[in-house]
Amino acid sequence: QSPIFGPQDVSSIEGNSVSITCYYPDTSVNRHTRKYWCRQGANGYCATLISSNGYLSKEYSGRASLINFPENSTFVINIAHLTQEDTGSYKCGLGTTNRGLFFDVSLEVSQVPEFPNDTHVYTKDIGRTVTIECRFKEGNAHSKKSLCKKRGEACEVVIDSTEYVDPSYKDRAILFMKGTSRDIFYVNISHLIPSDAGLYVCQAGEGPSADKNNADLQVLEPEPELLYKDLRSSVTFECDLGREVANDAKYLCRKNKETCDVIINTLGKRDPAFEGRILLTPRDDNGRFSVLITGLRKEDAGHYQCGAHSSGLPQEGWPVQAWQLFVNEESTIPNSRSVVKGVTGGSVAIVCPYNPKESSSLKYWCHWEADENGRCPVLVGTQALVQEGYEGRLALFDQPGSGAYTVILNQLTTQDSGFYWCLTDGDSRWRTTIELQVAEATKKPDLEVTPQNATAVIGETFTISCHYPCKFYSQEKYWCKWSNDGCHILPSHDEGARQSSVSCDQSSQIVSMTLNPVKKEDEGWYWCGVKEGQVYGETTAIYVAVEERTRGSPHINPTDANARAKDAPEEEAMESSVREDENKANLDPRLFADEREIQNAGDQAQENRASGNAGSAGGQSGSSK
């Protein structure tokens, strides 16, 4: 008794396809060993036709595939364009030779069934429209025309020229003649359903002089396209339902036995299980659209259908397209945090994995928005301007060769809570979804900058200090100047590092940065942060305003300014932070709302860099103390 299981008998007709599933015992060896499909010869030899090692015989070239689904302990053999020569005995099996574990399958391919002479065969998909052509002689030009459906010996009228329509074909069947034609009438049946399949007879006239034609209608379910995706990767369902439903609402649903539960539709419905990780994008005016799902989970595996109907819900008799999605748990995409928590005023460093083989690809970070179909405007990218509202508080740090880049967002507010996507212009499977949760801060931030009302005077020396707690003692501290293409590290001086770690004094852990002499181009956002190697941690930001030295104004020592900021009451500090906010650079937003636009992000950014890149690390006049 073989532990392999499959269909013993498979029957089909010429021109069709079959999809044969073979089940194997769930063991690690079985999951990874060679799978094969071979044809049994009279001599007892089984000739391989296709195998999971990549072998494909000449007679199967271009019409067969073998896909292993280790999660299900199955493999599937798809064979298209069947001919009667494919009839025979086969084996589906496992092992390095064709004598290992196997299951015998008998395939029978028969001719297209014989119908009465003059029978025209119409093959249509569910939801589509068929036009049945009925020829008649001139003598019946003025006679009654009709179409009936054979049920056993009887033939029940579907529609006739006296305007009778069978209730089950109401609003779906019309009988008409084209132009001046005097020898053909037509019957259109729209929104086809499986029960419409069968033998039809069209007739012109009555009695022995009547003209009759036979029509065999086959209504096909959509053959699901098999999709095999890795855990945590993404999948795109490309849906093309045709021009006739271009103006109807579109949906993607997941089959659940006889129902199909809508995941997303163009009327704003969305399954909460896909919140933050789904986008529906119209592709053109002909009704084409795509649905992208990121962060695939094991439970996302299943049968999906896209369709169109004014209700945005699945409706019998409307066109659909189908997929079967398998999610492979043996994923190349690393497991990264799906939820990142921050506090108001604080910062988060989000690590985005990408395909290490594509280190030169452009990296992006976008904010998923829930409006209607979902969209994800790019906030920052390796060659994209930081979007308005994020200046001075968002930067992307690429770490070539590491297979990851880091996005830092600081000055957090509760409005920053939501879903964000990491993506590149390379391997589209490597899209990861992160949920950012920002809670109200209950204590002072770990990093504090003094002076808080940072105004530097041209030509003078300006020092700014960043206080950090002892827990950051062993980490690398840095200052960087923020610009539209990142945050460029500056020379800085860590005063806490002179002490031994045993006697860390909480009040004297300072890393300071000095501008000497201050220049106009030094104005802007500066970040103080901590990191360990390429792992970025907490950051805080401050806007440094630069002003001309007014005649007669006292020359204030930077350290006095720091002291004054420390002593200032909270209200004063708040006021100064409002003033800082008014100084934020207002750059043109560059919104990249969907996948296609994401591809163009790099090109657009190239044009913008010249104007958007004021004050980079190269032009910085920072010095170490």
Epitope: F5, P7, D9, V10, S195, Q218, E223, K257, Q324
Partner: nanobody, 127 residues
Framework: EVQLVESGGGLVQAGDSLRLSCAAS????????MGWFRQGPGKEREFVAA??????????YYEDSVKGRFTISRDNAKNTAYLQMNSLKPEDTAVYYC??????????????????WGQGTLVTVSS
């Protein structure tokens, strides 16, 4: 909603034949699955045979112990599935259940894959 009614069970001698029928009422489409399961006295319910169809393709599955003796078939027009049982043995004695499902995916041996079940028909094979 699909209703299933089995018939054709009875008492036979070892080596005899019997044909079980399973009539389905309600909507059945151009794809679906019908299976036969059995439950012998004091035993678990077990898979016997299944038939899956998708458009013009039909797949037939059998449990090892009935291969070559039992044949599953379906009459499209009558919406009925049959189980032709030849060379019956005493160990085939059981209540035979018909199961149906609109879905043609999943392991046909798995009773959990079927949504609709008949009430069962008793087959007794005496030696």
């Amino acid at each position: 909603e699909v209703q299933l009614v089995e018939s054709g069970g009875g008492l036979v001698q070892a080596g005899d034949s019997l044909r079980l029928s399973c009539a389905a009422s309600g909507r059945t489409g151009s794809s679906g699955a019908m299976g036969w399961f059995r439950q012998g006295p004091g035993k678990e319910r077990e898979f016997v045979a299944a038939l899956m169809w998708r458009n013009t393709v039909t797949y037939k599955y059998y449990e090892d112990s009935v291969k070559g003796r039992f044949t599953i078939s379906r009459d499209n027009a009558k919406n009925t599935a049959y189980l032709q049982m030849n060379s019956l043995k005493p160990e085939d004695t059981a209540v035979y259940y018909c199961a149906a499902d609109p879905d043609t995916y999943g392991d046909p041996r798995n009773s959990g894959a079927y949504d609709y079940w008949g009430q069962g028909t008793l087959v007794t094979v005496s030696s």
